[in-house]
């Protein structure tokens, strides 16, 4: 899967929550960021994530599409210079400081269940999605026979009117 351009086709600032309306939050601890899945108190401000959308071409042996076989890839950045990364060895999702061009581990194939309900598939490990496990984000293997609607890999994007601190 090759990214067809070095620049995103668009960027979208949103808060990220689980299918069960728990918020994804990011906290700086001991000079590294931790990711939490938690219920926010009423009126508590939701953390914002910058989603950058890139076009990606299907591998030629995977698709009979020719030039129209495009996917949307996203990177997710909750704060300047930090991006979500897939750690496929540890089956974990981590926040790492990176410089552009970003490594493949920072890219996720976007799947829509509807326009504001999405799943994120690891670019480096097809069939593996960001999901929720024990109040943390983790990488979860989804069998092709399973429906992608399984709730622990579904996330909601909700718009935010605040500016990202990029």
């Amino acid at each position: 899967m090759s990214i067809t351009g070095i620049s995103p086709i668009t960027e979208y600032l949103a808060s990220l929550s689980t299918y069960n309306d728990q918020s994804i939050t990011f906290a700086l601890e001991d000079e590294s960021y931790e990711i939490y899945v938690e219920d926010l108190k009423k009126d508590e401000k939701k953390d914002k994530v910058l989603l950058s959308y890139y076009e990606s071409q299907h591998p030629s042996n995977e698709s009979g599409d020719g030039v129209d076989g495009k996917m949307l890839m996203v990177t997710l950045s909750p704060t300047k210079d930090f991006w979500l990364h897939a750690n496929n060895k540890e089956h974990s999702v981590e926040l790492h400081k990176s410089e552009k061009p970003l490594p493949d581990q920072a890219f996720f194939v976007l799947h829509n269940m509807h326009s504001n309900s999405v799943s994120f598939e690891s670019k480096t490990d097809p069939g593996v999605f960001i999901g929720v496990k024990d109040n943390h984000l983790a990488l979860i293997k989804v069998d092709s026979s399973e429906n992608l609607s399984t709730e622990n890999i579904l996330f909601k994007l909700s718009e935010t009117h605040h500016h990202h601190h990029h």
């Epitope: 086709i9 668009t10 979208y12 600032l13 949103a14 959308y53 076009e55 299907h58 995977e62 698709s63 009979g64 599409d65 020719g66 129209d68 076989g69 495009k70 996917m71 949307l72 194939v109 976007l110 799947h111 829509n112 269940m113 509807h114 326009s115 504001n116 429906n147 992608l148 609607s149 718009e159 009117h161």
Partner: antibody
Framework: EVQLVETGGGLVQPGRSLKLSCVAS????????MYWIRQAPGMGLEWVSS????????YYLDSVKGRFTISRNNAENTVYLQMNSLRSEDTATYYC??????????????WGQGTLVTVSS | DIQMTQSPSVLSASVGDRVTLSCKAS??????LDWYQQKVGEAPKLLIY???NLQTGIPSRFSGSGSGTDYTLTISSLQPEDVATYFC????????FGQGTKVEIK
């Protein structure tokens, strides 16, 4: 080359049923959301229904909910629109439309030539 | 539900003119917007996606811009073959078309 060919349109009386079919070629059908969009004579475009790539999620315009059913057969590269209890206001050209990106409901690109449904007594 | 309002409903301009079509959403749609061109008797054709990305094979005189609730399609130099109706389409929340702008040559 992407091709979408709709069939099944025609003249039907109010209250009756009609089933539209759309056969797709030129792309990996099972990767893409598919849509039905209609256009009443001389009017604008109106989204009617959507189905995700594996067929597990379907969405409808409020005025057709409970009357229309979208479905797909990925083995046969075909998407359907079953239309029951048809009304005169359903008269339109119905277009079959392909999603722009694999697995995504964001954006649409290729359209069929459309099939005309006329509901009249 | 998100409503999309296009203006003007009819636009008459001369060949070579710079033409601007407007589309306004009832809520922020986060640049999740396409523009389509429909000529008489034909199916619509995708021109611009995600607000400002030109679809393959579309002439570069077409461009899109906007954010939040306000979006614009610009034809930098109107050509006779651009006579058509232009529709905007949002997919940020559900799917909705604008009512269209008909472009004519003076």
């Amino acid at each position: 080359e992407v091709q979408l060919v709709e069939t099944g349109g025609g003249l039907v009386q109010p209250g009756r049923s009609l089933k539209l079919s759309c056969v797709a070629s030129g792309f990996t059908f099972s990767n893409y959301w598919m849509y039905w969009i209609r256009q009443a004579p001389g009017m604008g475009l109106e989204w009617v229904s959507s189905i995700n790539n594996d067929g597990g999620n379907t969405y409808y315009l409020d005025s057709v909910k409970g009357r229309f059913t979208i479905s797909r057969n990925n083995a046969e590269n075909t998407v359907y629109l079953q239309m029951n209890s048809l009304r005169s206001e359903d008269t339109a050209t119905y277009y079959c439309v392909k999603g722009h990106y694999s697995y995504s409901s964001y954006s649409i690109d290729y359209w069929g030539q459309g099939t005309l449904v006329t509901v009249s007594s | 539900d998100i409503q999309m309002t296009q203006s003007p409903s009819v636009l008459s301009a001369s060949v070579g003119d710079r033409v601007t079509l407007s589309c306004k959403a009832s809520h922020n749609i986060n640049k999740h917007l396409d523009w389509y061109q429909q000529k008489v008797g034909e199916a619509p054709k995708l021109l611009i996606y995600f607000t400002n990305n030109l679809q393959t094979g579309i002439p570069s005189r077409f461009s899109g811009s906007g954010s939040g609730t306000d979006y614009t399609l610009t034809i930098s130099s109107l050509q006779p073959e651009d006579v058509a109706t232009y529709f905007c389409f949002q997919y940020n929340s559900g799917w909705t078309f604008g009512q269209g702008t008909k472009v004519e040559i003076k």
